[in-house]
């Protein structure tokens, strides 16, 4: 879960609660067990988020 009040992470990145910052999803190849990698795999395309809140 992203910290309240923080800006959303840019495309291709996901919020890390452990590191308290947005992290590149590309780094999940090397470190797949990182907390933010779940957000990288689970993020649906933007239109679906808009249609189904």
């Amino acid at each position: 879960e992203q910290a309240p009040g923080t800006a959303p992470c840019s495309r291709g990145s996901s919020w890390s609660a452990d590191l308290d910052k947005c992290m590149d999803c590309a780094s999940c190849r090397a470190r797949p067990h990182s907390d933010f990698c779940l957000g990288c795999a689970a993020a649906p395309p933007a239109p679906f988020r808009l249609l189904w809140p």
Epitope: G12, L19, A26, R31, H33
Partner: antibody, heavy 119, light 111 residues
Framework: EVKLEESGGGLVQPGGSMKLSCVAS????????MSWVRQSPEKGLEWVAE??????????HYAESVKGKFTISRDDSKSRLYLQMNSLRAEDTGIYYC??????????WGQGTSVTVSS | DIVLTQSPASLAVSLGQRATISCRAS??????????MHWYQQKPGQPPKLLIK???NLESGVPARFSGSGSGTDFTLNIHPVEEEDTATYYC?????????FGGGTKLEIK
């Protein structure tokens, strides 16, 4: 503010040993992979060794040119990185940088410490 | 080992113009989603500084005049418009596999 500070460099004779140290501050040291990268006019930038995390059983990787000669280690309780260098040769001369990164790209670099191997 | 070949070795660009630096890898360093190529800037007497990671992701605090592109084996660093402070040597680096390797560097001079 992120800071990496190397020490331990200097002049050493061929065949000799030297131990480099790097102290880190300003980031969660125990969560970051660490490497030593060296630079010389002859070879440019050259990755030397890497050490991963406690959760990876402190896995280490080395460049072929230093395997069996150099040993990388870390002390998370002190936020310190080390490089033990044995059987030094002239080709090992250069500036040695301590680097920190979560994965892939080397986000943090120290100012470097100079190692000269010469008789 | 993956060999990274940078070109040109040096270039001189007029203030305000575009600088283009190329990095070619001896094998692909990309998946279908990401490229494991990174760019650094090094000024005399200083350590390298990360500019761009994963081919195109600008590092925090790096001016938007820097941009990166490419995938597979061919990558490009663009600087536009170049400023005096961009005088430096630029290096590419891959993290596709161990050993990590760096390109030979491109020295940029501002005319």
């Amino acid at each position: 503010e992120v800071k990496l500070e190397e020490s331990g460099g200097g002049l050493v004779q061929p065949g000799g040993s030297m131990k480099l140290s790097c102290v880190a501050s300003g980031f969660t040291f125990s969560s970051y992979w660490m490497s030593w990268v060296r630079q010389s006019p002859e070879k440019g930038l050259e990755w030397v060794a890497e050490i991963r995390l406690k959760s990876d059983n402190y896995a280490t990787h080395y460049a072929e040119s230093v395997k069996g000669k150099f040993t990388i280690s870390r002390d998370d309780s002190k936020s310190r990185l080390y490089l033990q260098m044995n059987s030094l040769r002239a080709e090992d001369t250069g500036i040695y940088y301590c680097t920190g990164y979560y994965a892939d790209a080397m986000d943090y670099w120290g100012q470097g410490t100079s190692v000269t191997v010469s008789s | 080992d993956i060999v990274l070949t940078q070109s040109p070795a040096s270039l001189a660009v007029s203030l305000g113009q575009r600088a283009t630096i190329s990095c070619r890898a001896s094998q692909s360093v990309s998946t279908s989603s990401y490229s494991y190529m990174h760019w650094y800037q090094q000024k005399p007497g200083q350590p390298p500084k990360l500019l761009i990671k994963y081919a195109s992701n600008l590092e925090s605090g790096v001016p938007a005049r820097f941009s990166g592109s490419g995938s597979g084996t061919d990558f490009t660093l663009n600087i536009h418009p170049v400023e005096e402070e961009d005088t430096a040597t630029y290096y590419c680096q891959h993290s596709w596999e161990i050993p990590y390797t760096f390109g030979g560097g491109t020295k940029l001079e501002i005319k």
